[in-house]
Interface confidence: medium
């Protein structure tokens, strides 16, 4: 979650992550090229609402100030931990060229070659150590280890890093060995659900573009709004069918059959007073999908959800009603009414997949997570285009911790606020080939909305 270059004893003690860009040591944050400068981290200081009522007891409060209070602030369209990259949607040495929008398409509409590129890219990401970032394996006050001299960090693969980010956003606050405090979720149960997962996907998409050397590589989506009792992406051509001899595992004909999961053993980390360190913890599992004759959401559910005009409503939590966000996340029924017995849309899709995908802390281990969230983001984008909300639609305060408009999304680094992602996909350099206004056209003629 932090750049390797900053995770030194000095960096941690000084709480400063302002690396030089290139070999010139004085080119801090690309300052000599006018790209950025080292600056105090701005954090949201407005009050949040329950259920997290503690103060100064969690690493993620005032993110990322428990770790770094000075980072690179990039100018213009420059971005990255050393201002060496461009903001999403921009390219060129000076980041002043609008990148042609990439197109996220239905996974079923990909050609065999495109499909292979996507699946191969995921597999490559699973096997490639992240070149720039490391994960922390201890909580903030134990970050320098028992002797106070050794940053507690670990390398992990690009895909496992993607998983770790999600785990870290939902893990418990740990008050002591074996005593978790379960009251916090920085990426679900509040308005940040949509922006957090949007940034999460953009991050992965950019990593896959780097890995494949293809700047126009786009994540596909899985239109899970079929109303069916089957997972039509759980095939060996796509994300792996069930194994004949053990249906909870993935068929040996799929490259995903050998994928091992990380960050699954929450209770174990709480007991051992540690964080997920990227150790493999067993094979990816999908228990019987659609158990109890459960059915996936329908297109009608999507349309009902899109007809809700309010982005979110107090208390901006899982019990908000007539809230587009809460209906999309799936705590409300699709029409915005609350029924605590019912799961819908995004939540229902996760639950339907069962296994690894049904638990928030481990869900991202399953590559179905990527295409499921890509479709969820497509629905969010359709809502943005239809409603063109002002930033005032997002609560400035009294959302749960992490969900206020100006809160830096945990644990992304360098810091990025919810507000910065409350834009249409087009403004962020991508689009969806999807029409959510009626029955989606057959895959060979999928249209842009």
């Amino acid at each position: 979650q932090f750049p390797r270059v900053c995770m030194t004893l000095d960096g941690v003690l000084n709480k400063e992550c302002c690396p030089p860009l290139g070999p010139e040591a004085t080119n801090i944050c690309g300052f000599l090229e006018g790209r950025g400068q080292c600056a105090e981290v701005q954090t949201d200081t407005r009050p949040w609402s329950g259920p997290y009522i503690l103060r100064n007891q969690d690493d993620r409060e005032q993110w990322p100030r428990k770790f770094f209070n000075r980072t690179c602030k990039c100018t213009g369209n420059f971005a990255g931990y050393n201002c060496g990259g461009c903001k999403f949607g921009w390219t060129g040495p000076d980041c002043n060229r609008k990148k042609p929008a990439i197109l996220r398409r239905n996974i079923h509409s990909l050609t065999a070659q495109e499909r292979e590129q996507f699946l191969g890219a995921l597999d490559l990401a699973k096997k490639s150590i992240h070149p720039d970032y490391v994960i922390t394996t201890q909580h903030w006050l134990g970050l320098l280890g028992p002797n106070g001299t050794q940053p507690q960090i670990a390398n992990c693969s690009v895909y496992d890093f993607f998983v770790w980010l999600h785990y870290y956003s939902v893990r418990d606050t740990l008050l002591g060995p074996g005593r978790p405090y379960k009251a916090i979720d920085f990426s679900h149960q509040g308005p940040a659900f949509v922006t957090w997962h949007r940034y999460h996907l953009l991050w992965l998409e950019r990593e896959l573009q780097r890995l494949t050397g293809n700047e126009s590589f786009a994540l596909p989506y899985w239109n899970f709004a079929t109303g069916k009792n089957e997972c039509d992406v759980c095939t060996d051509e796509l994300l792996g069918a069930a194994r004949q001899d053990d249906p909870t595992l993935i068929s040996r004909n799929s490259r995903f059959s050998t994928w091992e999961i990380v960050c699954d053993s929450l209770d174990d980390y709480n007991r051992r007073v540690t964080l997920c360190n990227g150790t493999y913890e067993g094979l990816l599992r999908r228990n019987k999908v659609g158990r109890n004759n459960e059915k996936l959401p329908t297109l009608k559910n999507v349309q009902d959800c899109l007809s809700l005009q309010k982005f979110d409503s107090p208390p901006f939590f899982q019990n908000s009603t007539f809230s587009f966000r809460n209906a999309l996340e799936g705590f409300d029924k699709a029409d915005g009414t609350l029924d605590s017995q019912v799961m819908n849309l995004h939540n229902l899709a996760h639950s339907f997949l069962n296994g690894t995908n049904a638990l928030p802390h481990s869900a991202a281990n399953d590559p179905v997570f990527v295409v499921l969230h890509s479709f969820t983001d497509a629905i969010f984008d359709e809502w943005l285009k239809r409603n063109n909300p002002s930033t005032d639609a997002w609560p400035q305060e009294l959302a749960p911790i992490g969900h206020n408009r100006m809160y830096n999304m945990v644990p992304f680094f360098p810091p990025v606020t919810n507000e910065e992602l409350f834009l249409t996909a087009e403004q962020l350099g991508y689009n969806y080939a999807v029409d959510l206004s009626e029955e989606e056209a057959p895959v060979w003629s999928t249209t842009l909305s």
């Epitope: 329950g50 259920p51 009522i53 503690l54 100064n56 007891q57 201890q138 909580h139 903030w140 006050l141 134990g142 280890g145 028992p146 740990l174 008050l175 002591g176 060995p177 074996g178 005593r179 978790p180 405090y181 379960k182 009251a183 007991r271 007073v273």
Partner: antibody, heavy 112, light 107 residues
Amino acid sequence: QVQLQQSGAELMKPGASVKLSCKATGYTFTGYWIEWVKQRPGHGLEWIGEILPGSGSTNYNEKFKGKATFTADTSSNTAYMQLSSLTTEDSAIYYCASGAYWGQGTLVTVSA
Amino acid sequence: DIQMTQSPASLSVSVGETVTITCRASENIYSNLAWYQQKQGKSPQLLVYAATNLADGVPSRFSGSGSGTQYSLKINSLQSEDFGSYYCQHFWGTPYTFGGGTKLEIK
């Protein structure tokens, strides 16, 4: 594994002060709260308060403010609780705890 | 401060029976509750954390349940080693108060 080792029993005079210690091993001492709990003979458990050794942050039960003071020494992984102006009401077993783990308790007896 | 009301205060039961101890919080504590067992002259031992999760090494005859303000600890098929005192404690904002305790005695 995680262990909390407390100092031995104390026999004190009324009005005196006593400092109890709790040495932690087996985990990163600085990062997690150490709590202090009082138990009078034949009574239940009373939460006195807690300290986060790495930052020195403390939370006290209102009832024990002015009576108990928490400190921690991160170099020896030891937390301390000082009890001042002792009265017979302070005679009790005092436990330190961190999460799921408890010390063996220190018996404090206040007697003239 | 949140008050924890534990009942019953004492209980006399035979080996092999099933018992349930309850704890009521004065406000919603969102499952941030622990149960402890304490034997005479010993430190409390954690049995259950976060209302429903069994701590390491605790036999499966113990189980925790509840949400909101109402919580309970159930012990199936009591064994002789289960006798002692039981306490609940909330972790929903300081002070982390305990229930008054339940003394479980052999009939």
